[in-house]
Interface confidence: medium
């Protein structure tokens, strides 16, 4: 059962797994959610009635019954992990904590103009988990404006103390705000010879990489495959770090694979969701339950529905036994990974899908697309929306993309002459415009947010957000697309598509069926040559064939330029402008979305921020951001 509210002056008795320090009860709840075993927690707030050494302690707890006895205690705040809930979860924490010093290893000290600059420095430093910044009012003159970058083994502070005139906060890597590059390759026959911070068992290098990505100290990893000569090390995933942040030595070894943490682009990759099945593979661990199941898929469902189940092994039924049902072994361990992996015993193993909600909804695999043809099929581009105006009569105005459960990203130039959001309607899950009747459900627009530097499409900043009046329930036909990661700025996208109901040629009409065209990206240098009279800036991206013939056109504006990278679709561009349509040597010009990620996050969160008073949170006064962008969903 999902319980989101916090229980004030309440302490859960027993069930302790470990104690960490967090600056708030809300963050304690997030830490509990991301911990492999934590189901409940008790946080101790700052209070005169409590021993100061116990302030800010966050005790993570587990219970076979999923609950524990409650005891009244002043300053204690208790609650449940979000593992039991179905909504999206995010580790992103933008809050700044005033007069708190979060202790850790201070590995870097420098002068910064503001706490925001200090936080940005932390976000762009590979080792940084959190920071403390001494403000201008700090009593000690030589420490004023000093930004301390910190890290710990767990990613959370080793202690938190009260300290006047300092502020503290966390790295925003998990908010998709890091400029650190993502090295997505997995290198075969390679061992990284650096210090191991941890080791777990994993069925393949991809799972090992995902474990590394969400492990606070892991910067890169080495995985020994099941063919590795040393039996005791088979399926071993070594989580590694180094002072420089890079592997110091690569050793060539057959049957080993190595790669990097993708922490700075984790919003656009599945990290917790290990959805594959591993055949002829047994996962060992603590047994939770043994139940009969018809198939390994059914066994995975049972594991997903059992809140404490982390992974499973299914042994298919012998021909005539048990009505064709096999045995489903539901299992768990201290770290969420099998304690050993065995092969050749006929089992089929896998992981719970309960943790998939900790990944961005936009990373969910969509149905395979139909290659060839120009007309799309239903569900092929589930983030594509059609934006209608009702004035003077109802018509398709522009395209747009779902990027969050209340947010559409589109082009600013679509709103020329649009006086009020009241005349706008957003239709999602639409393939044919003819489906839209008077009674077709739509989303009203609460607010139009146009980039304040926008003047005209050709001069850039052609980007706008629509805040919807109601939230989108994600289904196969309507779901978000991932924003590109700032860490992926150097990625060369090769599988890009433009979609829309726009004209197929100049002097045409809006198409009934959603059209699609695969279009290659063009370098900005090349694009600039084709548009001598315009300035093609780094905030624009161009796409098109030299010979013309395929392009976005009138009515496609605001729609997506969607590129598939590592099995995940990214919103690389927003259809903006071009000379004619599909003309020879005149590529289409798109808003380069990666350059606006900060702006998007700032706008989508500014609308949501509200101050929660001291009374609301039992003595904690701070800013809580209720994020609902696709990688910052409502709690």
């Amino acid at each position: 059962e999902c319980v989101t509210q916090l229980l004030k002056d309440t302490c859960f008795e027993g069930g302790d797994i470990t104690t960490v320090f967090t600056p708030s009860a809300k963050y304690c709840q997030v830490v509990c959610t991301y911990h492999p075993r934590c189901l409940l927690f008790t946080f101790t707030a700052e209070s005169p009635s409590e021993d100061p050494t116990r302030w800010f302690t966050c005790v993570l707890k587990d219970s076979v019954t999923e609950t524990l006895p409650r005891v009244n205690r002043t300053a204690a705040i208790s609650g449940y992990s979000f593992k039991q809930c179905s909504h999206q979860i995010s580790a992103c924490n933008k809050d700044i904590y005033v007069d708190l010093d979060m202790k850790g290893i201070n590995y870097n000290s420098s002068v910064a103009k503001s706490a925001q600059e200090c936080q940005e420095r932390c976000t762009d430093d590979v080792h940084c988990h959190f920071f403390t910044y001494a403000t201008r009012q700090f009593p000690s003159l030589e420490h004023r404006n000093i930004c301390l970058l910190k890290h710990t083994q767990t990613g959370t502070p080793t202690r938190i103390t009260k300290l006047d005139k300092v502020v503290s906060g966390f790295s925003l890597k998990s908010c998709a705000l890091s400029n650190l590059a993502c090295i997505r390759d997995i290198f075969p026959n390679t061992v990284f010879a650096d210090s191991n911070i941890d080791s777990v068992m994993a069925p393949d290098a991809f799972v090992c990489g995902r474990i590394c990505t969400h492990h606070p100290g892991c910067l890169f990893f080495t995985f020994f495959s099941q063919e590795w000569p040393k039996e005791s090390q088979r399926n071993l995933c070594l989580l590694k770090t180094s002072e420089s942040g890079l592997p110091s030595t690569r050793i060539k070894k057959s049957k080993a694979l190595s790669g990097f943490s993708l922490q700075s682009c984790r919003h656009s990759i599945p990290v917790f969701c290990h959805s594959s099945f591993y055949h002829d593979t047994d996962f060992l661990g603590e047994e939770l339950d043994i139940v009969a199941a018809k198939s390994h898929e059914a066994c995975q469902k049972l594991c997903t529905n059992a809140v404490r189940c982390q992974f499973f092994t299914y042994t298919p039924a012998q021909a005539s036994c048990n009505e064709g049902k096999g045995k489903c072994y539901l299992k768990l361990s201290s770290n969420g990974s099998p304690t050993k992996i065995l092969h050749g015993r006929g089992g089929i193993s896998g992981y719970t899908l309960r943790l998939c909600k900790m990944d961005n909804e936009c990373t969910t695999k969509i149905k395979p697309r139909i290659v060839g043809g120009t007309a799309s099929v239903r569900g092929e581009w589930p983030w594509q929306v059609t934006l209608h105006t009702t004035s003077p009569t109802q018509r398709h105005l522009c395209g747009g993309s779902i990027i969050g459960n209340q947010w559409i990203l589109t082009a600013a130039h679509c709103f020329y002459g649009v006086e009020s959001p009241k005349i706008l309607r957003v239709y999602s899950g639409i393939l044919n415009q003819s489906e839209i009747k008077e009674d077709t459900s739509f989303f009203g627009v609460q607010e139009i947010i146009i980039h304040d530097q926008y003047k005209m499409a050709e001069s850039g900043y052609d980007i706008a957000l629509l805040k919807l009046e109601t939230t989108v329930n994600y289904t196969d036909s309507q779901r978000p697309i991932c924003l590109p990661s700032k860490g992926d700025r150097n990625v060369i996208y090769t599988d890009c598509w433009v979609t829309g109901w726009g004209y197929r040629k100049l002097r045409d009409k809006i198409q009934n069926t959603l059209q699609k065209a695969k279009i290659p990206l063009v370098t900005n240098e090349e694009c600039q040559k084709r548009y001598r009279g315009h300035k093609i800036t780094h905030k624009m991206i161009c796409a098109g064939y030299r010979e013309g013939g395929k392009d976005a056109c009138k009515g496609d504006s605001g729609g997506p330029l969607s590129c598939k990278h590592n099995e995940v679709w990214h919103l690389v561009g927003i259809t903006s402008w071009g000379e004619g349509c599909a003309q020879r040597e005149r590529p289409g010009v798109y808003t380069n979305v990666v350059e606006y990620v900060d702006w998007i996050l700032e706008k989508t969160q500014a609308v949501e921020q509200k101050l929660i008073s001291e009374e609301d949170l039992g003595g904690e006064q701070k800013l809580i951001s209720e994020e609902d962008l696709h990688h910052h969903h409502h709690h």
């Epitope: 010879a193 592997p247 030595t249 050793i251 060539k252 150097n490 060369i492």
Partner: antibody, heavy 119, light 108 residues
Framework: QVQLVESGGGVVQPGRSLRLSCAAS????????MHWVRQTPGKGLEWVAL????????YSGDSVKGRFTISRDNSKSTLYLQMNSLTAEDTAVYYC????????????WGQGTMVTVSS | DIQMTQSPSSLSASVGDRVTITCRAS??????LNWYQQKPGKAPKLLIY???SLQSGVPSRFSGSGSGTDFTLTISSLQPEDFATYYC??????????FGQGTRLEIK
């Protein structure tokens, strides 16, 4: 065909700087790891520095660490070696080389550019 | 760092001879060893990679063998164009990448 062309060599005084360039053509430069290797007159080959295909990882040999910086511009298909605080021991022919095959072997080489450090 | 030692450092041979050059690594490098040929005033050229695989375009009279610490380059029947300096190089533990000191093959 695959080609690497170095430039920027010459005579320079000790303590001064020099920047070598290597222009690549005939292959997708941005996909491959690139290196600089040098050869002092009448001597053997010495590895100098490497850079990963996307510029994310850079390494250099102990003898040049902190003085030489390898970089690349994939949009120009060009590799660079910025050499600072040069000494007489840095006098050598500098080769730009790459690994384009599946094995870690230098299968493409430039013709080399001579750097002479002398007062 | 892994040290590579070649022997001999120079050798004289005649056209048609069978020639063997050896290379020893200071620790096991599996089969991550490459051989290069260099002619005066020219850049090195890859002959053999992964200890025994012949690079495309290289005549079949060149062959490589060995694994662990001991490797050999063999030229089965020396041709006039084979007189050059030969280098071995390990790609097992990198960086640094290390080369042997070279073997100069000259006409007797």
């Amino acid at each position: 065909q695959v080609q690497l062309v170095e430039s920027g060599g010459g005579v320079v005084q000790p303590g001064r700087s020099l920047r070598l360039s290597c222009a690549a053509s005939g292959f997708t430069f941005s996909n491959y790891e690139m290196h600089w290797v040098r050869q002092t007159p009448g001597k053997g080959l010495e590895w100098v520095a490497l850079i990963w295909y996307d510029g994310s990882n850079k390494y250099s040999g102990d003898s040049v660490k902190g003085r030489f910086t390898i970089s690349r511009d994939n949009s120009k298909s060009t590799l660079y070696l910025q050499m600072n605080s040069l000494t007489a021991e840095d006098t050598a022919v500098y080769y730009c080389t790459g690994i384009t095959g599946t094995e870690d072997a230098f299968d493409v080489w430039g013709q080399g550019t001579m750097v002479t450090v002398s007062s | 760092d892994i040290q590579m030692t070649q022997s001999p450092s120079s050798l004289s041979a005649s056209v048609g001879d069978r020639v063997t050059i050896t290379c020893r690594a200071s620790q096991s490098i599996s089969s991550y060893l490459n051989w290069y040929q260099q002619k005066p005033g020219k850049a090195p050229k890859l002959l053999i990679y992964a200890a025994s695989s012949l690079q495309s375009g290289v005549p079949s009279r060149f062959s490589g063998s060995g694994s662990g610490t001991d490797f050999t380059l063999t030229i089965s029947s020396l041709q006039p164009e084979d007189f050059a300096t030969y280098y071995c190089q390990q790609s097992y533990s990198t960086p640094p990448i290390t080369f042997g000191q070279g073997t100069r093959l000259e006409i007797k």
